[in-house]
Amino acid sequence: RRDVAHGILNEAYRKVLDQLSAGKHLQSLVARGVGGSLGGGAGDDAEPLSKRHSDGIFTDSYSRYRKQMAVKKYLAAVLGKRYKQRVKNKGRR
């Protein structure tokens, strides 16, 4: 079960990184049900790259790294909650 959860997490993380690199927003993923609320996911990743510098949003490697780590933590928390909930629900049956 833990392997399955890790598999889901890695797959979800890959999808989100694809979205980030395309300049898309995690919110769309949250809206499709992967998310929950851990602070919302409003994003410094919402705008296309061309617009970001004038908007004061950094695109250097450190900023990207910190954002990626934040996404990973966010998904781990959200999917961890879901997994615990699923186990809890199974126990009630």
Epitope: L26, S37, L38, G39, G40, G41, A42, G43, D44, D45, A46, G56, I57, F58, D60, S61, Y62, S63, Y65, R66, K67, M69, A70, V71, K73, Y74
Partner: antibody
Framework: VEESGGRLVTPGTPLTLTCTAS????????MGWVRQAPGKGLEWIGD?????TTDYASWVNGRFTISRTSTTVTLKMTSLTTEDTATYFC????????WGQGTLVTVSS | AAVLTQTPSPVSAAVGGTVTIKCQSS????????LAWYQQKPGQPPKLLIY???NLASGVPDRFSGSGSGTQFTLTISGVQCDDAATYYC???????????FGGGTEVVVK
């Protein structure tokens, strides 16, 4: 960026500082907290991502908690000692590119 | 946590001259370039000058420049002006953000 909530407290009293922004949407940026004791240097406390995930300096040891709503970022401080007397700054994004004027926290018995 | 050691204060500079401030980290910063420089004047909050080791922040005069990689970094102020009298801090960003830290600061005095 504007910080508020700083005041004189006695050791052990919990305190919450608030950070708000005008001219930009706070929810679109990671936000960090930094402090500066009187006459001393800057000390990085931690930051919060747009997803609500947090990172803290190793010295924080769970005493401080950063959280956010769509319009505010807060720093909750517990187990305060006189060593925590400082001006607390809130700053925008991971590079701390835009700072508030700071709010003074004085811990004294 | 990382330790960042800066050039001892104060550093004196003549108007029009050049000032160099060094920052040494006890461990390599992320991607060898996750280092920023800030300027702080008395009674004011710090101001970002340089990020990612060598990138000039928005609105910062180009007499400020940053260089270095890994554990050794330098802030250079060319054509020093009276307005540059301030304390300068470096900030290192690391693989583990728990290690993030500022240097102790370097005061620049302009004669």
């Amino acid at each position: 960026v504007e910080e508020s909530g700083g005041r004189l407290v006695t050791p052990g009293t919990p305190l919450t500082l608030t950070c708000t922004a005008s001219g930009f949407s706070l929810s679109r940026y990671a936000m960090g907290w930094v402090r500066q004791a009187p006459g001393k240097g800057l000390e990085w406390i931690g930051d919060i991502s747009t997803y609500g995930t947090t990172d803290y300096a190793s010295w924080v040891n769970g005493r401080f908690t950063i959280s956010r709503t769509s319009t505010t970022v807060t720093l909750k401080m517990t187990s305060l000692t006189t060593e925590d007397t400082a001006t607390y700054f809130c700053a925008r994004d991971y590079w701390l590119s835009l700072w508030g004027q700071g709010t003074l926290v004085t811990v004294s018995s | 946590a990382a330790v960042l050691t800066q050039t001892p204060s104060p550093v004196s500079a003549a108007v029009g001259g050049t000032v160099t401030i060094k920052c040494q980290s006890s461990q390599s910063v992320y991607d060898n370039n996750a280092l920023a420089w800030y300027q702080q004047k008395p009674g004011q909050p710090p101001k970002l000058l340089i990020y990612a080791a060598s990138n000039l922040a928005s609105g910062v005069p180009d007499r400020f420049s940053g260089s270095g990689s890994g554990t050794q970094f330098t802030l250079t102020i060319s054509g020093v002006q009276c307005d540059d009298a301030a304390t300068y801090y470096c900030l290192g960003g690391y693989d583990d953000a728990a290690d993030n830290a500022f240097g102790g600061g370097t005061e620049v005095v302009v004669k």
